[in-house]
């Protein structure tokens, strides 16, 4: 063992910015920090075979497999992948270790498999085996957490049936409204499945794994709060658990809470109560209504009553299938170049949606905010005043929804010109879409005031990339204008732009652009 070289195998995970196939490299690209792969001599193998930890990467990920060899003298090497030999250029680092790298850019199924590196040093020959596979994220799931009562205890368990197993955390807040935002100092997070402190104002449970994060809020009616203008509504799918918490605070313990569904008291076993004294010696009571697996007949008005507070209700609606309700008609907007503006979509959905905003084939993160009336809203303000088509797409487990928006930016036309042997064309993307005039410049009309009306053809076309309209005007060449300078002008309510073209040869000869406001 003392005679064997000290081998270190590492994996370098790259930020993707290129696409290629696996290639042997002497200098891998700039990257993240190397991860040790625990290279060890493979037990019971014939010959000296080192093996690196099995590598599992996402599709399209870019990685470098790297070997550092602490052995005296020069080394030569060869990579073999699927019976093909790949060249290998070792180099030496500052510690005089031999460094051999294999860069795999944009990982695909064809690049998965066994990579063998054969190294020959002055002292010995040995092989290093890397096994690279693609992570099967198709098996990954992230399900919204739900609540269960802990056996024989007044506590809630948060469960999320996800793969890989998620980290579950409770997110607690004792303030109202905005101060309960995720990163607010009023928010306390507890990374555990069981929660005993159930008296807080706002209680959520979140589960997170490689796919992201999903949260469920404990639906609460607070009898000390002024009721919402619209009745709070809770949607559930058949088979899901129902949990509603009724909370009330009073100066002393002399009050009780009860739950009713459509004026009938809930059955024993479908509720439990907890009470505590707060710091100012007032009594807090909470009464949970719960159904472990809801059916259609659990739909209705759930009313929490107190002997010392006005009653409040919530409408529980049990649906067979999830839904997304919103108007999907497309909307067009016209704004000034520096006007502040946001697209917005108001929707009602269950389960909660995942959404994206897309412009020019680029996706942007989508944020949703719950409104008091049971609706949610998603806004998009990051359009940077680029005209075109914007798409809002939302989906949940059962439904999909797409809405199109067109954004037009009011601006003066800008003209581009080109000429061929038979015609001259001008293009403009100003908005409102411009109108066109063509003028001939001659001895008689040095200021180009002689209007051309014959042989002019105007059209508007959609520039596909942005879903943005472009207007164009084409002048067919006639003997009357050949050899002359012509001027095309685009004008709208915000101004005029012109371009001058010489019509004497096939090549485009645009002259000075005139901007006339």
């Amino acid at each position: 063992n003392q005679d064997l070289p000290v081998i270190k195998c590492v994996l370098i995970n790259h930020k993707n910015n290129d696409s290629s196939v696996g290639k042997s490299s002497s200098y891998p690209m700039v990257s993240e920090s190397p991860e040790d792969l625990g290279c060890a001599l493979r037990p019971q193998s014939s010959g000296t075979v080192y093996e690196a930890a099995a590598v599992e990467v996402d599709v399209s990920a870019s990685i470098t497999l790297q070997v550092l060899v602490d052995a005296p003298g020069n080394i030569s090497c060869l990579w073999v992948f699927k019976h093909s030999s790949l060249n290998c250029q070792p180099h030496f680092d500052l510690q005089n270790r031999g460094v051999v790298s294999m860069v795999i850019l944009k990982m695909t199924e064809t690049q998965a498999g066994e990579y063998l590196l054969f190294i020959q040093s002055e002292a010995t020959n040995y092989t290093i085996l890397f096994t690279v596979s693609i992570r099967n994220t198709l098996l990954y799931t992230l399900r919204r957490p739900y609540f269960r009562k802990m056996e024989n205890q007044d506590a809630l368990v948060c469960i999320s049936e996800s793969v890989p197993e998620p980290i579950v955390e409770w997110v607690l807040c004792d303030s109202q409204g905005e101060s309960c935002k995720e990163e607010s100092p009023a928010v306390v997070k507890k990374e555990e499945k069981v929660l005993h402190e159930l008296f807080g104002t706002d209680i959520r449970c979140c589960a997170r794994n490689e796919l992201g994060r999903e949260c469920t809020r404990l639906f609460t009616i607070d009898l000390n709060q002024t009721p919402q203008t619209t009745l709070p509504q809770l949607f559930l799918k058949v088979g899901e658990p129902l949990w509603i918490r009724c909370k009330a605070v009073h100066v002393n313990h002399g009050f009780g809470l009860t739950w009713e569904l459509e004026n009938k008291a809930l059955e024993e076993g479908n509720y439990f109560e907890m009470s505590t004294y707060s710091t100012n010696r007032t009594m807090i009571r909470i009464l949970f209504a719960f159904v472990s697996s809801v059916a259609r007949n659990d739909t209705g008005y759930y009313t929490c009553s107190s002997s010392k507070h006005p009653s409040q209700s919530a409408l529980v609606t049990i649906v067979e299938k999830g839904f997304i309700n919103a108007t999907n008609s497309s909307e067009d907007y016209e704004i000034d170049q520096y006007e502040e503006f946001c697209f917005s979509v108001r929707f009602k959905a269950y389960p909660q949606i995942r959404c994206t905003w897309t412009f020019s084939r680029k996706s942007f993160p989508c944020e949703q905010k719950g409104l008091d009336n049971g609706y949610s809203i998603s806004k998009f303000c990051n359009h940077k005043h680029q005209p075109g088509e914007y798409i809002f797409h939302a989906e949940n487990d059962d439904a999909q929804f797409t809405k199109m928006f067109t954004l037009n930016i009011r601006r003066k036309p800008q003209v581009l010109a080109e000429a061929s042997a038979s015609q001259a064309s001008c293009f403009s993307d100003g908005y409102p879409l411009p109108s066109w005039t063509w003028k001939k410049c001659s001895d008689k009309s040095p200021n180009c005031t002689e209007e051309i009306t014959e042989g002019v053809w105007n059209r508007k076309a959609n520039r596909k990339v942005f879903g943005q309209w472009v207007s164009s005007s084409t002048l067919n060449m006639s003997e009357a204008i050949k050899g002359f300078l012509v001027k095309c002008c685009a004008y709208n309510s915000l101004g005029t732009s012109c371009e001058t073209i010489l019509l004497n040869s096939p090549g485009p000869f645009p002259f000075i652009q005139d901007n006339i406001s």
Partner: antibody, heavy 123, light 107 residues
Framework: QVTLKESGPALVKPTETLTLTCTVS??????????VSWIRQPPGKALEWLAH???????SYSTSLKSRLTISKDTSKTQVVLTMTNTDPVDTATYFC???????????????WGQGIMVTVSS | DIQMTQSPSSLSASVGDRVTITCRAS??????LNWYQQKPGKAPKLLIY???SLQSGVPSRFSGSGSGTDFTLTISSLQPEDFATYYC?????????FGQGTKVDIK
């Protein structure tokens, strides 16, 4: 270089929950088949394997302690957390975390260890 | 659960001695056995894996042998830094189990 470091309370009261964190560096629980394991050693006694968690989320627990243990890893991939509920004075021990390397068809348990953290369970 | 029985539980030896420690499994564990060395107040250190493979950086005076149920760790010529406690570990089946340890001290 590969390092593992345990952190958590030095003292817990009986029946309380013990939460220990192992922070790793030099390798990740993300792109390679790696696992982090917890092992304990009561004063003057032998080592006892408790649990481990692999990069893909796969977990295993000691049979005798399974009902009291939960192992999880942070999505940031640098921390592994072990929680032990309903602690008892017999749980007084030095708790170590150690790395397991997973190869194509074999495992190499505990090639690197943390320095250990002494936990006393006492009222 | 598989029981791992180490013998002897302690032994006294001198520098230069050949030392042998055995580990017996209560059932077949193939070659899924590792040996670790632990010094007081320190974490264990991997010496041998898969019954006979020497971990990188470990001196060649350490060797391992055996398969099935009977395994041996041999130190061919004991050095002053080898006085420590040695543990075997089986990882053939869950739960993984360690032997009770063998303490090697100076005669």
């Amino acid at each position: 270089q590969v390092t593992l470091k345990e952190s958590g309370p030095a003292l817990v009261k009986p029946t309380e929950t013990l939460t220990l964190t192992c922070t790793v560096s030099g390798f990740s629980l993300s792109n390679a088949r790696m696992a982090v394991s917890w092992i304990r050693q009561p004063p003057g006694k032998a080592l006892e394997w408790l649990a481990h968690i692999f990069s893909n989320g796969e977990k295993s627990y000691s049979t005798s302690l399974k009902s009291r243990l939960t192992i999880s890893k942070d999505t940031s991939k640098t921390q592994v957390v072990l929680t032990m509920t309903n602690t008892d004075p017999v749980d007084t021990a030095t708790y170590f975390c150690a790395r397991i390397v997973g190869y194509s068809d074999w495992l190499l348990p505990f090639d690197h260890w943390g320095q250990g953290i002494m936990v006393t369970v006492s009222s | 659960d598989i029981q791992m029985t180490q013998s002897p539980s302690s032994l006294s030896a001198s520098v230069g001695d050949r030392v042998t420690i055995t580990c017996r499994a209560s059932q077949n564990i193939n070659r899924f056995l590792n040996w670790y060395q632990q010094k007081p107040g320190k974490a264990p250190k991997l010496l041998i894996y898969a019954a006979s493979s020497l971990q990188s950086g470990v001196p060649s005076r350490f060797s391992g042998s055996g398969s099935g149920t009977d395994f041996t760790l041999t130190i061919s010529s004991l050095q002053p830094e080898d006085f420590a406690t040695y543990y075997c570990l089986q990882h053939n089946s869950y739960p993984w189990t360690f032997g009770q340890g063998t303490k090697v001290d100076i005669k």
